[in-house]
Amino acid sequence: SPTPFGPEGQLADELHKPKAIQTEVKPSVRFNLRTSKDPEHEGCYLSLGHSQPLEDCGFNMTAKTFFIIHGWTMSGIFENWLHKLVSALHTREKDANVVVVDWLPLAHQLYTDAVNNTRVVGHSIARMLDWLQEKDDFSLGNVHLIGYSLGAHVAGYAGNFVKGTVGRITGLDPAGPMFEGADIHKRLSPDDADFVDVLHTYTRSFGLSIGIQMPVGHIDIYPNGGDFQPGCGLNDVLGSMAYGTITEVVKCEHERAVHLFVDSLVNQDKPSFAFQCTDSNRFKKGICLSCRKNRCNSIGYNAKKMRNKRNSKMYLKTRAGMPFRVYHYQMKIHVFSYKNMGEIEPTFYVTLYGTNADSQTLPLEIVERIEQNATNTFLVYTEEDLGDLLKIQLTWEGASQSWYNLWKELRSYLSQPHNPGRELNIRRIRVKSGETQRKLTFCAEDPENTSISPGRELWFRKCRDGWRMKNETSPTVELP
C-alpha cells in the first residue's frame, strides 16, 4: 500500500521489532466462517495451515463454499448488506460454507490506497483456496466468490492467482475508478473463473462512474440500463433520510447490485430475467426480448452458466424494491398515417388487461422519433403478473418538440379554426412477452374505426388467430 501509515506499513514495522517487544498484530485479511444467520454470532476464524478450526466449526468439504468479499469502506465496519447476504445464502444453501473475507484494515483507507491493496487481498484468498485444495473432497469447482464493488476485483485477483479454476465469481457492481479500461490482469475478467457473472447498477457516462461501465464477465447484466435505479432518486432518499444527498443516491444505486443478488436467493419463485442487447437504447426500444440462442438468462444466483459467451451485455427493468421482478413486453405499433400532425410528436399510453390483473396506464417511452407508415417498437413493463393478455387500451397525446413548434401549432390553429383534428391511424398492435416468449397480435375492436385523436381511446382485442408461439422459440432458461 502506498500510504506511509497504512496497515501494511504498521505490519512491516511490527515484524522488524525484536520479538520481545512485538505486540500482537491482527492479520490484515481474515476469513470468518459464518456458522449462523445471526450477525451478532462471531462465527469461526479460519487460519491458513490450521485444520482444527475447520473441524471445530463444521466446515463441509463436499458442499458449496461461498466467499463474500466486501469493498472499500469509509466507516471501517461491516455494512448491513453483508449480514443480509450471509443470511440469504444460508437460507438458500443450507449445507454450504459461507466465509466472509474481512479485509477491513486494508479497505478502510483512502479509496486509491484501498485499490492498491486489492492485489494482496486477492493473493491471500488464493493462498487460502490452495491450502483448502490440499484437503480431501474439497473442490475448487464448488467455490463461488461474491465480491461487491472493490471486492469484485479482489475476487478477480483471487481467481487469477489460485492454482486451478474457481467455479464461479459474481461481481456485484465492480468498482469503476482505476479499473475502467484496465488490462484484464488488473481487474475482474472472464478468465478469473469458470463462470463470471456481473451486475452493474451504478454506471455513469458523466461525473465519476462508481461502478465499472465496461463488461468484465461472461455475462454482464445492466438492470435499468445500469444507471438510474428506481427508488434511488434524490426524492426517494430524501423521504427516508434526514438529508437526501448525492452520497445516499450513490450508495443506494451501487448497493442495489447486492440487493438484486439477495432477491435472487430468497425469492426463487420470482426470478428476474435479463435479455441480451447491444446497448441500453436498443433495449429501451423493446428490440431485445428474445430468448433464442441463449439470449436471455436469470439474474443473480440463478444465472445459468454460459461459458461460450464473453462480455455479453444483458438488460432488464426492475421494481424499486424486493421482489425486483417485472414483466417485460415488446409492443410493435404500426402507425399507418398521420393527419394534420404538424410538428407534434405523439406520446402513447397503453393499459393492458389480462386474465390475472390489469396494468396501470403505462407511457411508451420514445427513444427515437415515431415513424409514419412504419412499425414502431416499444418496451413496456408491469410490476404485476397480468396473466394472458386479453385487450389493450391505447391513447395518445401530442408533445411539442420545442416552444417554437408549439407557437407554430398555435398560430396554425388560430389562422384555421376549422382545421380538422389531428389523428393517427393504428390498426393493430403486436405484443411479445419477455418472460413467456409468447407473441400475440391485437386488432382494433372496430376495424372500420382505427383513427385516434389526442386524448381519445382506441381498444384492441386479441385477433382471431389467437396466441401464436413461434416454433423456433425455445427458451434456454426455465421460464415460469
Epitope: T3, M74, L208, T247, E248, V250
Partner: antibody, heavy 119, light 107 residues
C-alpha cells in the same frame, strides 16, 4: 444546502494552544469526512488531516501529527482541531472542508479561521 | 510525498480570452486531480474533480484535461468573476498535496 461554519479569528501567544471549530449543516454529519487545510499568508495550501465522524477515524499528515489533534462532537455536528505549542510558523488561515468519496476532492469549504501567533 | 507543481504563479489575460493553467505531479496520479478556485475574499470552491468532471454549479466555460502526471485547467471565455487564484490538488494518495497556485489577473 451544505454549510461549514468555522469559528472566529484567534490571536494567541507563542507556546499556547488554540481550538478551532467547524460546524456542519445540511447533510448527514456521520457520512462524510472533514479535512483541515492550512494556508499561510500569500502561500499555497497544505493538507493537515481528516476526521471521519462515522467511526472516529483520523488520519494526519506526518508533518502535523505532533501539532494538530482532531476531535468531534456528534451531538453538535462539530469537528474540532486543536493546535498546540504554537509558534509564528503556525500563523495562518485554517480551513475545514468536506471530502467527496471516490473522487478524493474537497467539495465544500468553510470560510476559514485566521490564527495569529504573536507575543 | 507527491509534489504538485504549477509553473506559472501569475497570469495576466483579457476578458473573453481562453486561459490555460497547467499542473504537474511528481508521479502518476491516475486522474485523481482536482482544481479549486480561491476568490480574492478567501472563499475556496471546487471547480473540477477527477481531472475533467465539472462540480455542480460550476459554469461550463471551465474544463479540465490531462492524464498521468500532466494536467490542465482551461477557462474558455474569461469573465470578471474568474479573477482568482487557482490551485490543483492530487487525491491519489495521502498526504494530499496542492500546487502552489496560479494567480489570474486582468491585463
Amino acid at each position: 444546502q451544505v454549510q461549514l461554519q468555522q469559528s472566529g479569528a484567534e490571536l494567541v501567544k507563542p507556546g499556547a494552544s488554540v481550538r478551532l471549530s467547524c460546524k456542519a449543516s445540511g447533510y448527514t454529519f456521520t457520512k462524510y469526512t472533514i479535512h483541515w487545510v492550512k494556508q499561510r499568508s500569500g502561500q499555497g495550501l497544505e493538507w493537515i488531516g481528516w476526521f471521519y465522524p462515522g467511526s472516529d477515524s483520523i488520519k494526519y499528515n506526518e508533518k502535523f501529527k505532533d501539532k494538530a489533534t482532531l476531535t468531534a462532537d456528534k451531538s453538535s455536528r462539530t469537528v474540532y482541531m486543536e493546535l498546540s505549542r504554537l509558534t509564528s510558523e503556525d500563523s495562518a488561515v485554517y480551513f475545514c472542508a468536506r471530502h467527496e468519496e471516490y473522487t478524493n476532492s474537497l467539495a465544500y469549504w468553510g470560510q476559514g479561521t485566521l490564527v495569529t501567533v504573536s507575543a | 510525498d507527491i509534489q504538485m507543481t504549477q509553473t506559472t504563479s501569475s497570469l495576466s489575460a483579457s476578458l473573453g480570452d481562453r486561459v490555460t493553467i497547467s499542473c504537474r505531479a511528481s508521479q502518476d496520479i491516475s486522474n485523481y486531480l482536482n482544481w479549486y478556485q480561491q476568490q480574492p475574499d478567501g472563499t475556496v470552491k471546487l471547480l473540477i474533480y477527477y481531472t475533467s468532471r465539472l462540480h455542480s454549479g460550476v459554469p461550463s466555460r471551465f474544463s479540465g484535461s490531462g492524464s498521468g502526471t500532466d494536467y490542465s485547467l482551461t477557462i474558455s471565455n474569461l469573465e470578471q468573476e474568474d479573477i482568482a487564484t487557482y490551485f490543483c490538488q492530487q487525491g491519489y494518495t495521502l498526504p494530499w498535496t496542492f500546487g502552489g497556485g496560479t494567480n489570474l489577473e486582468i491585463k
